[in-house]
Amino acid sequence: ESLGWDIAELQLNHTGPQQDPRLYWQGGPALGRSFLRGPELDKGQLRIRRDGIYMVHIQVTLAICSSTSTSRHHHPTTLAVGICSPASRSISLLRLSFHQGCTIASQRLTPLARGDTLCTNLTGTLLPSRNTDETFFGVQWVRP
Amino acid sequence: ESLGWDIAELQLNHTGPQQDPRLYWQGGPALGRSFLRGPELDKGQLRIRRDGIYMVHIQVTLAICSSTSTSRHHHPTTLAVGICSPASRSISLLRLSFHQGCTIASQRLTPLARGDTLCTNLTGTLLPSRNTDETFFGVQWVRP
Amino acid sequence: ESLGWDIAELQLNHTGPQQDPRLYWQGGPALGRSFLRGPELDKGQLRIRRDGIYMVHIQVTLAICSSTSTSRHHHPTTLAVGICSPASRSISLLRLSFHQGCTIASQRLTPLARGDTLCTNLTGTLLPSRNTDETFFGVQWVRP
């Protein structure tokens, strides 16, 4: 672990209450193929424990969705990954809208610091799939 | 190689016969920019030779496709990447549907073990593009 | 740096003049969360300084876009990442069309050599978003 190979891959636990757009994540071998090796979960949000540049990746699929599902709903469904705390470092890192699709997937390199908590905000009114091969979120430390 | 930097990037060779949804891959410098350094191909399917956590990524583009192509076909076109053998470890790792798009692309971190064979199943009735910049599949060992 | 951990994450600076489909990138801590550690920018294009296999990733979002925006325009909007110089190594590495979506995102492993300059060509008549969480381009050296 001292090599700094911090890494995590999480699966969706649940969505937040109505006014909370955050997705709540879980990880661990008992749950399937998700794991946390270095980073930790704080009330379902991912907290970084080692400074460095990370590859952050995410895929979110909307539940029982067809290409017409997303157009039925007025408010566009958008997924944003960002640093939500500490407040002084709050920033959106990655943002995607579903438009007429049912899945978004992306990845990016970004510097993260010990104590940064990442939030994944799903705005709109569609429930995400909890299937572990359709919705997942992970980070990988790649260099100091 | 002893560092465990197993890595592969493959290009599409061909699709399977009618009842076989698997894509068959090929790799090697003679073919272009594809390569296998550690993992190997077994009848067009990628076999892992070193235990560890891997970043698996894929992009598949449907051939001669427009946004109406995918909506014309009744059965949704879906791509699933999974461990198909050994049977005891069979699981779907990553799944995406095309809906009204012509390309899917995603990536995830997942633990893989020596001997795991990865299959990429394309269900539906649309042929994938064999262009090497449109359809590719790869894995990268990232840590033990 | 001698470890070969070359890495870069860039944000969009501007598009080219009318006959130039290339996107022009910028990076550096003063600009936000973009950075260059090893690779360098040459007139807004990314130049590789170390041989190896790289993970190349990109996300491009079209500006003020809805799912109907892309279908309104006759020429499909396509993003291609390739080696544009030296001319002897010119090749398309990764290509995606927007179809009825507003964002493309993908990644791939590819061998790159010192001196390779990567270009990202956006064909079509739609402007990309310059928001740093919507449009970005990066490379990460992963092994020799």
Partner: antibody, heavy 120, light 111 residues
Framework: QVQLQQSGPGLVQPSQSLSITCTVS????????VHWVRQSPGKGLEWLGV???????DYNAAFISRLSISKDNSKSQVFFKMDSLQSDDTAIYFC??????????????WGQGTSVTVSS | DIVLTQSPASLAVSLGQRATISCRAS??????????MHWYQQKPGQAPKLLIY???NLESGVPARFSGSGSGTDFTLNIHPVEEEDAATYYC?????????FGGGTKLEIK
């Protein structure tokens, strides 16, 4: 608080049309979908259709040829119209709100119901 | 369309005891990591009231003596301990696909 108030006739002549208005309060039709369901002794609860927040509609295939649902967001009203009623359309007709999650397709608040008899 | 079959059609349960109502779907209503089954209570002269959504989630304001379980095709609504005000007809409803359909109802009488 959330309320759905229905207004419409109790008696409809055979082959005539049924129109019901559902006036909502405590929520916005630009955010929530509204379903229509009917209940009869013979057929129990039957889902008829829904109008989504966008104004897009989905109908039960069994009623698609004679059912129309529309709305006026500014007046917080949803309009239900069914043509060519016959005696087996005699039922209580309800409007009901879809919960916050659009793909849940459940009904968390209901109107009081409009009892409709089809008879000459 | 998915057909939902409820059983029993009616039952009588003593005050304070457990009432168990079953609902069987003609095909699985589980998808995307959720179970798309909901339960309603309807009292005479009133509209149905949502009790349970997604098989096991208690709707806000519903007493904790109501609970739902099941996945795939077989579902159960439990009420324990039964109170007098629970006398009503209970319906299951799926939303796995359009059209949503309802079960035929189970009438609960309190002894």
């Amino acid at each position: 608080q959330v309320q759905l108030q229905q207004s419409g006739p109790g008696l409809v002549q055979p082959s005539q049309s049924l129109s019901i208005t559902c006036t909502v309060s405590g929520f916005s039709l630009t955010t929530y979908a509204v379903h229509w369901v009917r209940q009869s002794p013979g057929k129990g609860l039957e889902w008829l259709g829904v109008i989504w927040s966008t104004g897009i509609t989905d109908y039960n295939a069994a009623f698609i040829s004679r059912l129309s649902i529309s709305k006026d967001n500014s007046k917080s009203q949803v309009f239900f119209k069914m043509d060519s009623l016959q005696s087996d359309d005699t039922a209580i007709y309800f409007c009901a709100r879809n919960p916050h999650y659009g793909n849940l397709n459940a009904m968390d608040y209901w109107g009081q119901g409009t009892s409709v008899t089809v008879s000459s | 369309d998915i057909v939902l079959t409820q059983s029993p059609a009616s039952l009588a349960v003593s005050l304070g005891q457990r009432a168990t109502i079953s609902c069987r779907a003609s095909k699985s209503v589980s998808a995307s990591g959720y179970t798309w089954m909901h339960w309603y209570q309807q009292k005479p002269g009133q509209a149905p009231k949502l009790l349970i959504y997604l098989a096991s989630n208690l709707e806000s304001g519903v007493p904790a003596r109501f609970s739902g379980s099941g996945s795939g095709t077989d579902f159960t609504l439990n009420i324990h301990p039964v109170e007098e005000e629970d006398a009503a007809t209970y319906y299951c409803q799926h939303s796995r696909e359009l059209p949503p359909t309802f079960g035929g109802g189970t009438k609960l009488e309190i002894k």
